[in-house]
Each structure stands twice: as structure tokens, then as C-alpha cells.
Interface confidence: medium
Amino acid sequence: KETAFVEVVLFESSPSGDYTTYTTGLTGRFSRAGATLSAEGEIVQMHPLGLCNNNDEEDLYEYGWVGVVKLEQPELDPKPCLTVLGKAKRAVQRGATAVIFDVSENPEAIDQLNQGSEDPLKRPVVYVKGADAIKLMNIVNKQKVARARIQHRPPRQPTEYFDM
């Protein structure tokens, strides 16, 4: 289970139409459910239940998008429509270049994601928890435009892509 280095960049637009960026670094783990490779894209927050419906009509995320899913406590969803792995697959089917799960409330999901799958996804499936998950969800919950860049080695220049 390799470390996933995640850079999250928040884009704030000013009244003049210019954009300012704020970069945050955090770490997670690549799960065995997906590939250990780099990915980047705009963050799209996905509710676990939102992955249940089969509606594939997504807005055009032309440059690729990264799905972020905050998993709930298992007691709140005793009969989930899909397993955690199924949710990851559904997000990738819809075009996600990667999926990041916040497993803080559902640590059992880590084992589910790391069960050796015969057919792992060709995109990264990363999980975060603790302080890193809090950092990530704080950004996602701002409802502003943000991009994530996932790497399997530490970024040499942390703000290379995004420092404007």
C-alpha cells in the first residue's frame, strides 16, 4: 500500500474575473482496488448514495475529474446499494480519473478496498483519513472549484502545476 501524495488546489475568483489559487498538500494511500499511478482533475464531490443511481449523464469534465466520496458510518447504511469497491467502479465508469475515499467514519472500508481484486481498476483508488481527510473535506465543502493532483512520489516542486 503505497503512499499517495495529493495536491489540492482551490481556485478563488475575484470580482475582477482573475483567479487566485491556494495549494494544500496531503497524503493518503493507494488501495489495491485501483492502479498506483498519477492522476489529476477537477474535484467532484460524490455522495455515496449518488453513486447508486445508474444515471451516466454527467456534465462534461473535459480535462478529467477526481471523485471524492466521504463514506458514512456503516450503521447509517446497513444495506448499501453497492460495496465500496462497487462505488469506486461506478465513479470510474462515469469518467473519474481517480477516486478518493474519506474512510474516517468507516475504517472497515480500508480492508474492502485492499482485498486482492482479480480485476483492479485501471485508475487510482485512494483513501484518506484523520487530519488529511479533514483537510480535504474542508476544501471540498467550500463548494468552490478545486483540482486534485495525485502522485505516487512526493512532488519535487509542490506548486509546479498550480502556482499562478
Epitope: F11, E42, L60, E62, Y63, E160, Y161
Partner: antibody, heavy 121, light 108 residues
Framework: EVQLVQSGAEVKKPGASVKVSCKAS????????MHWVRQAPGQRLEWMGW????????KYSQTFQGRVTITRDTSASTAYMELSSLRSEDTAVYYC??????????????WGQGTLVTVSS | EIVLTQSPGTLSLSPGERATLSCRAS???????LAWYQQKPGQAPRLLIY???SRATGIPDRFSGSGSGTDFTLTISRLEPEDFAVYYC?????????FGQGTKVEIK
């Protein structure tokens, strides 16, 4: 100051290829996508494709698929557009334009000055 | 692909007058991803409006955009001498990105 500076005018024979460059300065090259758009004399603008300057991913218009190749050199902050199997209808001004790569953000907010490519036997 | 049709083809007006340019899409433009550009002879296009109604950096407030779905409008409240040019609409909500054929605003 943001600037996109393109290479000079080219005259090519039918069947040949042309490679136009677009050098970016004044911003972080890898934070943006670079698009290529062309305009034939007296015609509307026509989108050709883009490259994500950060990771090199590309997307091309079906109209040019197989004939156009967009690349970039991050160390030189330069994007390139190569068009092959040129025909007279490819005579046009070719522009590069940058895009912030976020939904809701401004598309094509800065453009190169344009490169005239003339295809003539 | 989404086809954009602009009208009128040419608009003959005097400085100080109001200009209203129309852009109609063959199908709904996703999330109002519609932009307007100004182009003068021998120059590259310049972004005026994006997201149907947001002014780009440095664009004077006499330029405004409105509309959603398939019908969009660019309004220039009081034409200045430097506003006489060709205006293009562009949709960037679905691939391929497409442009209208342009509206020329000329001095009457």
C-alpha cells in the same frame, strides 16, 4: 504580463506538414491547457484541439483527428501544433489560446497573435 | 456537434447607440458555457464574456451578456469607436467547442 508568442508565417506545398509553436510567458504554463483554433480567410473560428500542459493529455476535434498532433515542452513553456497532409483548404491563420481547466472559469482568455499558414502548389 | 447561429450578420450603428447581438444554439448549451469574443482585422480574438454573463478581466461594463439554454445575447450599451469589430459566440460546454459565424458591427 501574460503573453503567447507564435512562430512566423509558413508557406507549404499540398501533402506536406507544418508545425506551429506557441511560447507562453507571464504565468505558470503547466496550470493551463493550450487550445488551437484556426480561421480560414473570411470564415468562422474553428476549434482543433487542446493539450493539458501539466500532464500532456490531449483531445482533438473529429474534423482533424489523425492529421493534427498537439505537443508541449514544459521546460520551454511552449506548445506545438503539427498538421499533416496539408491541402489548400488548410490555408488559414492558426491561433493558440490558453484555458484555465476549471468549470466555470474563463475559456481562451489569452490568445497568440496568430500564424498564417499558406498551402499552395 | 452544437451549431451556433448568430444574427444579424451585419449591424450598422452609430457611436453612442445600443447594439444587441444574438446567438442561437442548435441544442441546449450545458451550464451556460457560452462565451463572446471581439475580433478586429488582423488581430486575435479577445474574450469579452464567459459563462453567458460574466465579464472577462478588463472588459468595460458597457458589455453585458445574458441568456441560457439555446438563446444568448450580447449587449453593448453605448457603442464607442473602438467597439466596431466582428463578434463571435462560442460554446464550450460540449466537445467539439464550436463558434458562431460572427456578427459584424460597422459604423453607419
Amino acid at each position: 504580463e501574460v503573453q503567447l508568442v507564435q512562430s512566423g508565417a509558413e508557406v507549404k506545398k499540398p501533402g506536406a506538414s507544418v508545425k506551429v509553436s506557441c511560447k507562453a510567458s507571464g504565468y505558470t504554463f503547466t496550470s493551463y491547457a493550450m487550445h488551437w483554433v484556426r480561421q480560414a480567410p473570411g470564415q468562422r473560428l474553428e476549434w482543433m484541439g487542446w493539450i493539458n500542459a501539466g500532464n500532456g493529455n490531449t483531445k482533438y476535434s473529429q474534423t482533424f483527428q489523425g492529421r493534427v498532433t498537439i505537443t508541449r515542452d514544459t521546460s520551454a513553456s511552449t506548445a506545438y501544433m503539427e498538421l499533416s497532409s496539408l491541402r489548400s483548404e488548410d490555408t488559414a491563420v492558426y491561433y493558440c489560446a490558453r484555458d484555465l481547466m476549471v468549470r466555470g472559469g474563463p475559456p481562451f482568455d489569452y490568445w497568440g497573435q496568430g500564424t498564417l499558414v499558406t498551402v499552395s502548389s | 456537434e452544437i451549431v451556433l447561429t448568430q444574427s444579424p450578420g451585419t449591424l450598422s450603428l452609430s457611436p453612442g447607440e445600443r447594439a444587441t447581438l444574438s446567438c442561437r444554439a442548435s441544442q441546449s448549451v450545458s451550464s451556460s458555457y457560452l462565451a463572446w469574443y471581439q475580433q478586429k482585422p488582423g488581430q486575435a480574438p479577445r474574450l469579452l464574456i464567459y459563462g453567458a454573463s460574466s465579464r472577462a478581466t478588463g472588459i468595460p461594463d458597457r458589455f453585458s451578456g445574458s441568456g441560457s439554454g439555446t438563446d444568448f445575447t450580447l449587449t453593448i450599451s453605448r457603442l464607442e469607436p473602438e467597439d466596431f469589430a466582428v463578434y463571435y459566440c462560442q460554446q464550450y460546454g460540449s466537445s467539439p467547442r464550436t463558434f458562431g459565424q460572427g456578427t459584424k458591427v460597422e459604423i453607419k
